[in-house]
């Protein structure tokens, strides 16, 4: 007896009869930048404050007839999805609406900027609890809109935006492409990407996660008790804004980085049929559907990590790609991936006082991606130890030699174009898990971290015969921090983390003879923090 | 999600020093850039967001806006300052002819200029 979308985001423990999770986001204020709204609709009456902010362009067309209920349609529905009495996600959240979209649902980058500035000034004048800003709109890529979002996010505001309804790479749109914003794609009742006419949800590495966005029942501006179904990435973003409000109400001190990691962690994994996405976007698009956490507390003990893909490097010989973590996150490992298999590896390097992950294209390569593993590790002290190419035939190796430092990731980078083509695999000597091993022509980089209670272990999975994909996963209670391929397999396209699984991809097996060179080994570094677990037990 | 990518047009105008000296050259070594939406139907030429360098104060933003208006007037162009930004980004929103872009890019404190564009409900 509840709408499918509310059931979908609700963990089983709340599903007894009705959707009634505890504490409906009452400590949080959600700002909505959208059309005008019907604030006396029963779903939202008394919980949405219409601000006096309005910055909209004139409607197109001389014969446009401004009908109140149509002008309010989009915003009213979204306000209802976020905080509606009956069909809302965060039934206790209070909202403030700013009108930046006209009766045709059209606005401007400049109007949105002025709206964001209005929110920042309001926050300074009257500081309240946690703020969530919902931006259910999209335009072309805009440097200035992304910059404004970055500034607002760094002022402690959580921004949630629609990925866009253009069946396209979300990185081509703003604010969807802003790294600091939580960007949400849309899925349907079958957990499939939403199709909207000839278009549909956007996808790609700029999407953080998906959420219900098709046939979403919500407040209709047609009448004060009416409901209507609407679809789009706006509806999906509204779900995530509601979930964020719930999480922040339960834990008001959560930072943006912590919130994003929790949203990812509690999402349903690997339920989306990736065949809907263009082939080149499948690996980049997160297979995550948002859900509420099963309980309001107890997540603090977890070591949270996420995978961040860079933009494509482009095909030039010296092209590089850089993946960055958020300011509050630690880069615990760095890997690379190339569809052609022609790459020169990757390295962790300092940039502006922070480690970044840089991948290098090779001559004749179509380009590379850098893949950063970004984690929340309080009081961490991480450094990169590098070993230059070795002369010895045993290959290059490097370990974490500082007292109390553990290995969280391995990277290798080489200057030669045809590394390892005719060389046998180099195997890690047993009993030395705290070191990285690589080709003798490669420089090897070990990510070594010290943090209270941090412990890590190496897990390998090798397949002797050629395989397009080899995976190794960390067990329950452990979090994947590093993912790499054991050297010696020249046909490896790269390695990357998907949730808690390390994936090593190889060239199409039909093009690889089943020689010893066909052996592929995936190496995962799995970590956990006893300190975080103890701290959470003490809280409880 | 990266700030610096996207199917995105960046027009870096290599500025010649042929101006009449009324505009101070930007701090040496930095060239202000012009950006516009890659999706042509979404462009809104005639309105521009002038973004100033990060630490620019409100008074400097207002002064830069007035300076642009004065220099535009000398060339016979009408401009209108629609909004002065402060709190998030320093800068201002100006309604002006695209002919004035080269002039605006030479103003002191200018980091980049972006042509306004449309956004849509999703």
């Amino acid at each position: 007896s509840i709408p499918w979308n509310l059931e979908r985001i609700t963990p089983p423990r709340y599903r007894a009869d009705e959707y009634q999770p505890p504490d409906g986001g009452s400590l949080v204020e959600v700002y909505l930048l959208d059309t005008s709204i019907q604030s006396d609709h029963r779903e939202i009456e008394g919980r949405v404050m219409v601000t006096d902010f309005e910055n909209v362009p004139e409607e197109d067309g001389t014969r446009f007839h401004r009908q109140a209920s149509k002008c309010d349609s989009h915003g009213t529905h979204l306000a209802g999805v976020v905080s509606g009495r009956d069909a809302g996600v965060a039934k206790g959240a209070s909202m403030r609406s700013l009108r930046v979209l006209n009766c045709q649902g059209k606005g401007t980058v400049s109007g949105t900027l002025i709206g964001l500035e209005f929110i920042r000034k309001s926050q300074l004048v009257q500081p309240v609890g946690p703020l969530v800003v919902l931006l259910p709109l999209a335009g072309g890529y805009s440097r200035v809109l992304n910059a404004a979002c970055q500034r607002l996010a760094r002022a402690g505001v959580v921004l949630v935006t629609a990925a866009g309804n253009f069946r396209d790479d979300a990185c081509l749109y703003s604010p969807a492409s802003a790294p600091e914003v939580i960007t949400v794609g849309a899925t349907n009742a079958q957990d499939q990407p939403v199709t909207l006419g000839t278009l549909g949800t956007n996808f790609g590495r700029c999407v953080d996660l998906f959420a219900p966005g098709e046939d979403i029942i919500g407040a209709s501006s047609d009448c004060s008790t009416c409901f209507v179904s609407q679809s789009g990435t706006s509806q999906a973003a509204a779900h995530v804004a509601g979930i964020a409000a719930m999480m922040l109400s339960a834990e008001p001190e959560l930072t943006l980085a912590e919130l994003r990691q929790r949203l990812i962690h509690f999402s349903a994994k690997d339920v989306i049929n990736e065949a809907w996405f263009p082939e080149d976007q499948r690996v980049l698009t997160p297979n995550l559907v948002a859900a509420l956490p099963p309980s309001t507390h107890g997540a603090g003990w977890q070591l949270f990590c996420r995978t961040v893909w860079s933009a494509h490097s482009g095909p030039t010989r010296m092209a590089t790609a850089v993946a960055r973590c958020a300011p509050d996150e630690e880069l615990l490992s760095c890997s690379s991936f190339s569809r052609s298999g022609k790459r020169r590896g990757e390295r962790m390097e300092a940039q502006g006082g922070k480690l970044v992950c840089r991948a290098h294209n090779a001559f004749g390569g179509e380009g590379v991606y850098a893949i950063a593993r970004c984690c929340l590790l309080p009081q961490a002290n991480c450094s990169v130890h590098t070993a230059p190419p070795a002369e010895a035939s045993m290959g290059t190796r490097v370990h974490c030699h500082q007292q109390g430092h553990v290995l969280t990731g391995c990277s290798s980078h080489w200057e030669v174009e045809d590394l390892g083509t005719h060389k046998p695999p180099v195997l890690r000597p047993r009993g030395q898990p705290n070191q990285c091993v690589g080709h003798r022509e490669a420089s090897i980089h070990a990510s070594c971290c010290h943090a209270p209670g941090l412990e890590c272990k190496v897990k390998e999975h090798g397949i002797p015969a050629p395989q397009e994909q080899v995976t190794v996963a960390c067990e329950e209670g452990w979090t994947l921090t590093g993912c790499s391929a054991l050297p010696g397999t020249s046909h490896v396209l790269g390695a990357y983390a998907v949730d808690n699984t390390c994936v090593v991809r190889s060239r199409d097996v039909s093009t690889t003879g089943s020689t010893s060179e066909g052996a592929v080994t995936a190496v995962a570094i799995c970590c956990r923090s006893r300190h975080l677990a103890q701290a959470s037990q003490e809280l409880q | 999600q990266e700030d610096e990518d996207g199917d995105y047009e960046e027009l870096v105008l290599a500025l010649r020093s042929e101006e009449d000296g009324l505009a101070e050259a930007p701090e040496h070594g930095t060239t202000a850039t012009f950006h516009r939406c890659a999706k042509d139907p979404w462009r809104l030429p005639g309105t521009y967001v002038v973004v100033l360098k990060e630490e620019t104060h409100l008074s400097q933003s207002e002064r830069t806006a007035r300076r642009l208006q004065a220099q535009a007037a000398r060339r016979g162009y009408l401009t209108k300052i629609l909004h002065v930004f402060h709190g998030l980004l320093p800068g201002f929103l100006v309604k002006m002819s695209g002919d004035l872009l080269e002039l605006a890019l030479k103003l002191p404190h200018v980091d980049y200029i972006e042509e306004d564009s449309s956004v849509f409900a999703q």
Partner: antibody, heavy 126, light 106 residues
Framework: QLQLQESGPGLVKPSETLSLTCTVS??????????WSWIRQPPGKGLEWIGS???????YYNPSLKSRVTISVDTSKNQFSLKLSSVTAADTAVYYC??????????????????WGQGTLVTVSS | EIVLTQSPATLSLSPGERATLSCRAS??????LAWYQQKPGQAPRLLIY???NRATGIPARFSGSGSGTDFTLTISSLEPEDFAVYYC????????FGGGTKVEIK
């Protein structure tokens, strides 16, 4: 079959608080599909909606009565109640409780009032 | 608030005749209008909802029409049990009822 039954004092003094309870039988009050409403009818006059509540206790009141009205719900007893403060003779009416389909679950039926209780007359007099 | 004005206040007709009741809204209520029947000593009963849809169990002689501000309830051939008071109600904005039309036997 769902039935609603109003109960409470038939006589209230001016300036006091009118209190009525509606007991729902033949169905559960704890459903997202419905709102539970109070409507009144002064003798020989038309109907006036007072306010509504859902099983979660979320209320929605007539703006003209909002300052005086409190509606509450007790799901364990399958009841909802009305309190109207500072009453005057103008509040003398037959008070009805009724179910209203919320519209959230379209299958629940049309978004209007029905069924109704049989009504209880409350007289405000000293 | 939206005011609903019903006319006539009283309609005197004989069984078998056609009854036409009018309800006018002070502003558009789109099609969000219902008709109720109330007999003496009883609670109202829903007849027509969303301007023209018959509620469950309501005979076909009852029909509703109109949208925006002007609405009509028609009883094609009055039966003895149809003599009662009829109210219109809108839900475009909050809930308001009309003053009622009494259909009495002539």
């Amino acid at each position: 079959q769902l039935q609603l039954q109003e109960s409470g004092p038939g006589l209230v003094k001016p300036s006091e608080t009118l209190s009525l309870t509606c007991t729902v039988s033949g169905g559960s009050i704890s459903s997202a599909s419905y709102y539970w409403s109070w409507i009144r009818q002064p003798p020989g006059k038309g109907l006036e909606w007072i306010g509504s509540i859902n099983y979660r206790g979320s209320t929605y009141y007539n703006p003209s009565l909002k300052s005086r009205v409190t509606i509450s719900v007790d799901t364990s007893k399958n009841q909802f109640s009305l309190k109207l403060s500072s009453v005057t003779a103008a509040d003398t009416a037959v008070y009805y409780c009724a179910r209203e389909n919320s519209g959230v679950v379209p299958a629940a039926g049309p978004n209007w009032f029905g069924p109704w209780g049989q009504g209880t007359l409350v007289t405000v007099s000293s | 608030e939206i005011v609903l004005t019903q006319s006539p206040a009283t309609l005197s007709l004989s069984p078998g005749e056609r009854a036409t009741l009018s309800c006018r809204a002070s502003q558009s209520v789109s099609s969000y209008l219902a008709w109720y029947q109330q007999k003496p000593g009883q609670a109202p009963r829903l007849l027509i909802y969303d301007a023209s849809n018959r509620a469950t169990g309501i005979p076909a002689r009852f029909s509703g029409s109109g949208s925006g501000t002007d609405f009509t309830l028609t009883i094609s051939s009055l039966e003895p049990e149809d003599f009662a008071v009829y109210y219109c109600q809108q839900r475009r904005n909050w809930f308001t009822f009309g003053g009622g039309t009494k259909v009495e036997i002539k």
